[in-house]
C-alpha cells in the first residue's frame, strides 16, 4: 500500500482560478493541433488494476513523465500559457516527491510505461497530444491526490 500521507496534495493547489484557466487554455490550444483523436492517453487503460489508494502515486509518475519528456522539450511552444503552467505543474511534482509505494508497483509501472510508449511512438504528435490532455491530467491528479 502507498504511504498515503505523502501521496496527498492540498485542495488549495487546485483552487486557483487563474492557473486552472491557463492550464485548460493550454490544453485546448494543443488539442486543436492534435489530429489523432482515436488515442487517449489518460483514460481507463492507464488506471486498469490500480486501487483508489494507489491512484495518486500513478498520477505522480504521469506528471513527472509529462514534465520531463513533453513539457520541457516543448517549452517554447503554446506561449504564453506554457511559461505559466510548467512551473505550476513542477511545484505539484515537487510536493509529491515523497509519495512512494511500499511493495510491488509493477502493475502501475506497466500502465505508465504503456502511456510513455504511446507518446514516444507518436513522436511529436504524441507530445502535442499529451499537452492537449493537460486538462485531464490536472483533473485526474486532483481527483487522485486531494
Amino acid at each position: 500500500a502507498p504511504i498515503s500521507s505523502h501521496c496527498r496534495l492540498d485542495k488549495s493547489n487546485f483552487q486557483q482560478p487563474y492557473i486552472t484557466n491557463r492550464t485548460f487554455m493550454l490544453a485546448k490550444e494543443a488539442s486543436l493541433a492534435d489530429n489523432n483523436t482515436d488515442v487517449r492517453l489518460i483514460g481507463e487503460k492507464l488506471f486498469h488494476g490500480v486501487s483508489m489508494s494507489e491512484r495518486c502515486y500513478l498520477m505522480k509518475q504521469v506528471l513527472n513523465f509529462t514534465l520531463e519528456e513533453v513539457l520541457f522539450p516543448q517549452s517554447d511552444r503554446f506561449q504564453p500559457y506554457m511559461q505559466e503552467v510548467v512551473p505550476f505543474l513542477a511545484r505539484l511534482s515537487n510536493r509529491l516527491s515523497t509519495c512512494h509505494i511500499e511493495g510491488d508497483d509493477l502493475h502501475i509501472q506497466r500502465n505508465v510505461q504503456k502511456l510513455k510508449d504511446t507518446v514516444k511512438k507518436l513522436g511529436e504528435s504524441g507530445e502535442i497530444k499529451a499537452i492537449g490532455e493537460l486538462d485531464l491530467l490536472f483533473m485526474s491528479l486532483r481527483n487522485a491526490c486531494i
Epitope: 500500500a1 489518460i42 488506471f47 483508489m52 485531464l136 483533473m139 485526474s140 487522485a144
Partner: antibody, heavy 119, light 112 residues
Framework: EVQLVESGGGLVQPGGSLRLSCAVS????????MIWVRQAPGKGLEWIGI???????YYASWAKGRFTISRDSSKNTVYLQMNSLRAEDTAVYYC?????????????WGQGTLVTVSS | AVVLTQSPSSLSASVGDRVTITCQAS??????LAWYQQKPGKAPKLLIY???TLASGVPSRFSGSGSGTDFTLTISSLQPEDFATYYC??????????????FGGGTKVEIK
C-alpha cells in the same frame, strides 16, 4: 462481453436480513471496483457503497453499520449483506462496475433485483 | 455532502425537439459530472462523463456542457428511444468517502 447479474432479492420481514449477489463476467474483480446503488419505487438513484480493487470498502453514511459489501474473486461475485431491514429499504438494488478514467464512472450496470420489506 | 438539483423534474416534448436538462451542484465539482439514461424497468446507462465526453456507443445527438456548479445535458433532436429519465451524478473527492458519489433527482422526458 461484460455482464453483471444480480440475484437474491425477494420479500423479507422488517428486522430481517438478506444477502444480494452480483455475478460478473467478462472482467476481473481484481481490476475493477464495484458499487451498489438502490432505487426505491418511483424514486431516484441512491449510492450505497463501493468495494475497491484491494478489497477496501466505503459506504454512504446512512448505510454504515447495516450494509456490508464483500466479494469472492474466485466466484467473480460481489455481495451486499443487508441487516435490520426496514420498509424504507424496499427498492431495486443494482450493482455496477466502477471504471476510473480520472473520475469514477459507473458502467455497465446489472439488471437489478427487487427487495421488498413488508410484514 | 454535495446536492445536485435537476430541472425540470419532468418535461413533455415531441420527436425532433431540442431538449435541455440542467443540473446544479451545491458546490464546485469541476467537471466531475456524469449523465445516465434510465428507461422504465431497466438499469441506468452511462451517456456522458467529464461533463462533456460522450460514452462509447452513445449517439452524437447527446451532448453535455458545463463546469463548476452548472451543467447541461442537451438532446439536439429527440428520437422515440430517448423518452426516459435522465440523472446527473457527481464525484466529490477530498471529503469523507461516505459522500463521494451523489445523484440528482432525475428528469423524466415524456412524449407530448
Amino acid at each position: 462481453e461484460v455482464q453483471l447479474v444480480e440475484s437474491g432479492g425477494g420479500l423479507v420481514q422488517p428486522g430481517g436480513s438478506l444477502r444480494l449477489s452480483c455475478a460478473v463476467s467478462g472482467f476481473s474483480l481484481s481490476s475493477y471496483a464495484m458499487i451498489w446503488v438502490r432505487q426505491a419505487p418511483g424514486k431516484g438513484l441512491e449510492w450505497i457503497g463501493i468495494i475497491d480493487i484491494d478489497g477496501s470498502t466505503y459506504y454512504a453514511s446512512w448505510a454504515k453499520g447495516r450494509f456490508t459489501i464483500s466479494r469472492d474473486s474466485s466466484k467473480n461475485t460481489v455481495y451486499l449483506q443487508m441487516n435490520s431491514l426496514r420498509a424504507e429499504d424496499t427498492a431495486v438494488y443494482y450493482c455496477a462496475r466502477d471504471r476510473f478514467v480520472g473520475v469514477d464512472i459507473f458502467d455497465p450496470w446489472g439488471q437489478g433485483t427487487l427487495v421488498t420489506v413488508s410484514s | 455532502a454535495v446536492v445536485l438539483t435537476q430541472s425540470p423534474s419532468s418535461l413533455s416534448a415531441s420527436v425532433g425537439d431540442r431538449v435541455t436538462i440542467t443540473c446544479q451542484a451545491s458546490e464546485d465539482i469541476y467537471t466531475n459530472l456524469a449523465w445516465y439514461q434510465q428507461k422504465p424497468g431497466k438499469a441506468p446507462k452511462l451517456l456522458i462523463y467529464w461533463a462533456s465526453t460522450l460514452a462509447s456507443g452513445v449517439p452524437s445527438r447527446f451532448s453535455g456542457s458545463g463546469s463548476g456548479t452548472d451543467f447541461t445535458l442537451t438532446i439536439s433532436s429527440l428520437q422515440p428511444e430517448d423518452f426516459a429519465t435522465y440523472y446527473c451524478q457527481a464525484c466529490v473527492y477530498g471529503n469523507a468517502a461516505d459522500s463521494r458519489y451523489t445523484f440528482g433527482g432525475g428528469t423524466k422526458v415524456e412524449i407530448k
